[in-house]
Structures are given as C-alpha cells and as structure tokens.
C-alpha cells in the first residue's frame, strides 16, 4: 500500500538526482586540479544530509553548512561575474573568458544548476513527485535555501571589481527581488570590493537607448554607493557581437568598441 505523500505545487526532484550530483562532482574535480582533493562521496552525503528526512518547508542555511564547507573555493580578485535573469549569456561568456567565474562555474553551483530536489519529513526517501514552489508553497524549500546560501557565500568572498550581467529586455533591469538584488548585492564586502560594474545586455538589434539611465539601474547605483562601493555601468548593445569579440578580440570590428561606458 503506497504511503501518503505530501503534494506540493512545484515539480518533483529531477530524475536520477543522486547520480547527477555524483557524476557532476566527479567530472568537476577531475577538470579542476585545485579541487582534486574533494571526495564526491562526502559531497553527496553532505548534500543529502541537508534535505533528506527534513520537512521541505523548514530548510535553513545551517542545513547546507557541511556542504558549503566541503565546496569551499575561491575566485581571484576581479574575476567574479554575477548575473540576473540572463544566465545563458553569462555562462556563454565564462565558457569563452575562462578566467572569469559565475556561481555555476564553481563546484556547488555546477552540481545544482537546473536541478530540483526535496525530501520528506521522517523518511529517507527523495520526493520525485512534487517539491515546494517558492510562491505557492514556501520560500524555505531545499532548492531556494541552497541558492540563497551559496549565492551569499559567493558574494561574500568576491573581491576587486565585481561584474554583473543584467537583462536589458526586462521591465525591471535590476530587480530587488532577484537573487542578485536580494542576496548578492547586500553581501558584497566594501572592504574587499572596490567597484561593481554592471553590463546591461540589450535585446533588440536596433535598440540604441542608454539603459544605464534606467530608473532601476539608478536604484542599484544608489544601493551600491551607500555601501561605499563604486558603481560603473556599460551598455552591451550587441550581445552576439560582444561574445564574438571576447572570442576574437583582434577582429578589426571589435577595436572600435562595442559598448558605451558610464562612470558614476
């Protein structure tokens, strides 16, 4: 007789979640020599321990601390790339610009990228049927708390000039409710971070507006300035050209400059 299971509004744990986490971890530690010391069995055990047998609307950042400790990794100064609502382009960029890193280029972000997971109170089972939805069920669910935890840590450890890629096609280019706006912005450390440079990515080919003057960008500038961090903004008018020029900086069409600077 199948036992009763809580029904949540969100989709269930990603199929083959444990195998995916393990396989990604093994591959990552092979590719990144500085992480060769990591035992992926311990990583999986710590990941599992954060949510298995726990009520999935009562997960805390503390639950993820053993995992965070195992995945400790540092990014060189000036090499952190944050992003908001434009993940694919940010990842395409760091795949070309190999010395810059998004959270998903780090072990823990890489493990969890695009995955969903949750357990159930008092059973060792993973719930493959449904997981809590952030809006409809609860915000303290395993996935949301994970990303909040690792995003906080990623921002806290950043240093030098930090870059953020923002989606200029959205009504709120800077959204205070995004992970960037609610977590990362507030956890950049002024004693380590000299400046935040925003790259506003334009969507339309003929869009020549200066989106660095957008009210939400002004709001971001205000928040950052109040935290004693300098703020710069650039329009990236042609993201396709931008990526092409990152790949081939010597290309003659790249030398004229593909974005406008706004120093604040």
């Amino acid at each position: 007789v199948p036992r009763w299971r809580q029904q949540w509004s969100g989709s269930g744990t990603t199929s083959r979640f444990p195998e995916t986490v393990l396989a990604r971890c093994v591959k990552y530690t092979e590719v990144h020599p500085e992480m060769r010391h990591v035992d992926c069995q311990s990583v999986w055990d710590a990941f599992k321990g954060a949510f298995i047998s726990k009520y999935p609307c009562n997960i805390t950042e503390e639950d993820y601390q053993p995992l965070v400790k195992l995945g400790t990794q540092t990014v060189p100064c000036n090499k952190t790339l944050l992003w908001s609502r434009i993940k694919d382009l940010a990842h395409q960029f760091t795949q070309v610009q190999r010395d810059m890193f998004t959270l998903e280029d780090m072990l823990l972000g890489y493990l969890a990228d695009d995955l969903t997971w949750c357990g159930e109170f008092n059973t060792f089972e993973i719930n493959y049927q449904s997981c809590p939805d952030w809006r409809k069920d609860c915000s303290n669910n395993p996935v949301s708390v994970f990303w909040k935890t690792v995003s906080r840590r990623f921002a806290e450890t950043a240093c030098g000039v930090v870059h953020v890629m923002l989606n200029g096609s959205r009504s709120k280019i800077f959204d205070k409710n995004s992970t960037f706006g609610s977590v990362e912005v507030h956890n950049l450390q002024p004693e380590k971070v000299q400046a935040l440079e925003a790259w506003v990515i334009h969507g339309g080919r003929e869009d020549s507006r200066d989106l660095c003057q957008d009210p939400t960008i002004k709001e971001l500038e205000s928040i950052i300035s109040k935290r004693n961090i300098r703020f710069f903004c650039k329009n990236i008018y042609r993201p396709d050209k931008f990526l092409q020029c990152v790949k081939n900086p010597e290309d003659s069409s790249c030398l004229s400059g593909i974005h406008h600077h706004h120093h604040h």
Epitope: A23, V26, P33
Partner: antibody
Framework: QVQLVQSGAEVKKPGSSVKVSCKAS????????INWVRQAPGQGLEWMGR????????YYAQKFQGRVTITADESTSTAYMELSSLRSEDTAVYYC??????????WGQGTLVTVSS | EIVMTQSPATLSVSPGERATLSCRAS??????LAWYQQKPGQAPRLLIY???TRATGIPARFSGSGSGTEFTLTISSLQSEDFAVYYC?????????FGQGTKVEIK
C-alpha cells in the same frame, strides 16, 4: 554494501581482443567513475582509464589510447573494458575500481587475461 | 606523466616494529596522494587518501604524511597481517600513476 564482481579468466591469442565485465552492486552506479587498472605478473599497478556512466564520459591513459574501449550498461550496472590487438605483454590481472575522487575505494576481485599463442 | 618512485623496494621488519615507507613524485602532486596495501592473490585495498586521511576501517597504526613531492607511510607497530606490498598513487595529474611498490616482509 558496494561490491564489484568481475568476469572469469580468459586465454587469448595475440592480435585478438578481450572484453572484461565488472558488475556493481550498491547505489548510484551511474554517478561514480569506474576505473580499470592492470597488473602484469609480479609487477606494479597501471591505470588504464575510466568511465562516468551517467555522462558517457571516458578518459584513457595515452598508452592505451586507440586500443582500449571502456563502456557501461546502466540498466545492469555493469562496466566493460575491451582491449584489442593483444600482445604477450598484455598478460595481466585486470581490475575494475570504483571512485568518487582520484583514489580507488572499491575494487573488483580481478580478472586474469593470458595472451599466448 | 608523473613518475612515482617508492623506496625501499623491500623492507624487512620484525613484528611489533615500526615501518617507514617512502614515495617520491617527479613533480609536485600537492596532497593528492593515496596509499594501498596488496596481499598475494588479492585486489589492492585503500589505506590512505589526501596524503594523510585514513580510509574507512583502516587501523590507527597506519598513518600518512607529506605533501608536494615527498610522502611517507608509517606503520607504527607491525602486525602479522600487515606483511604485504604497499603502493602509492598520485591523482593530481592525468594519467593517475602508481609507484612500483614496497614489499614489507618478515625479518
């Protein structure tokens, strides 16, 4: 309990191929690396390559590149190592070993492959 | 590839005595080094990883130390079941490579 059970001993002619199997018990077979390590009689250990079954991702030591093929059947939790163009120097015990890192925590019992005309 | 050199090739020790085995890497492998024990007719058994961390179920008399290019496996008080061949293995650079082994025999 993790166990790796390998296929039985083989006698092969020079120039032929051999395919050794390694059946795993225990959780999440597909997520770990299954490595192959060989040991010639009275000699040391030599890493040949590995597969991460879920990713279908293989990596071979340069020495064996082109001669070794490692595969996995996720439905039966079995990994395979095929070595072609056999020569007498390939006479060895072949081990499979499971890893979640660069070290090998679990080993099969070994399969003796004898290459002789 | 990184060459691992173990010394001595054979170590003769009396039961209850201390055994010290050495492993040298041809270039730095950081702390990415493991030690295995192998008895005749058996598969190797993991003893140490991360140069100094004992694997599950390994007695405290086995200890590892070192980093970079020089490593040591110490068996503080040899028991009869410890007489075997010991291998070091680096996992810092592809391909993973093993030393040629040190045989610990009864004196």
């Amino acid at each position: 309990q993790v166990q790796l059970v390998q296929s039985g001993a083989e006698v092969k002619k020079p120039g032929s191929s051999v395919k050794v199997s390694c059946k795993a018990s225990g959780d999440f077979f597909s997520g770990y690396a299954i490595n192959w390590v060989r040991q010639a009689p009275g000699q040391g250990l030599e890493w040949m390559g590995r597969i991460i079954p879920l990713l279908g991702d293989t990596y071979y030591a340069q020495k064996f590149q082109g001669r070794v093929t490692i595969t996995a059947d996720e439905s039966t939790s079995t990994a395979y190592m095929e070595l072609s163009s056999l020569r007498s120097e390939d006479t060895a015990v072949y081990y499979c070993a499971r890893s979640a890192a660069g070290w090998f925590a679990y080993w099969g019992q070994g399969t003796l492959v004898t290459v002789s005309s | 590839e990184i060459v691992m050199t173990q010394s001595p090739a054979t170590l003769s020790v009396s039961p209850g005595e201390r055994a010290t085995l050495s492993c040298r890497a041809s270039q730095s492998v950081s702390s990415n080094l493991a030690w295995y024990q192998q008895k005749p007719g058996q598969a190797p058994r993991l003893l140490i990883y991360g140069a100094s961390t004992r694997a599950t179920g390994i007695p405290a008399r086995f200890s590892g130390s070192g980093s970079g290019t020089e490593f040591t496996l110490t068996i503080s008080s040899l028991q009869s079941e410890d007489f075997a061949v010991y291998y070091c293995q680096q996992y810092n650079n592809w391909p993973w490579t093993f030393g040629q082994g040190t045989k610990v025999e009864i004196k």
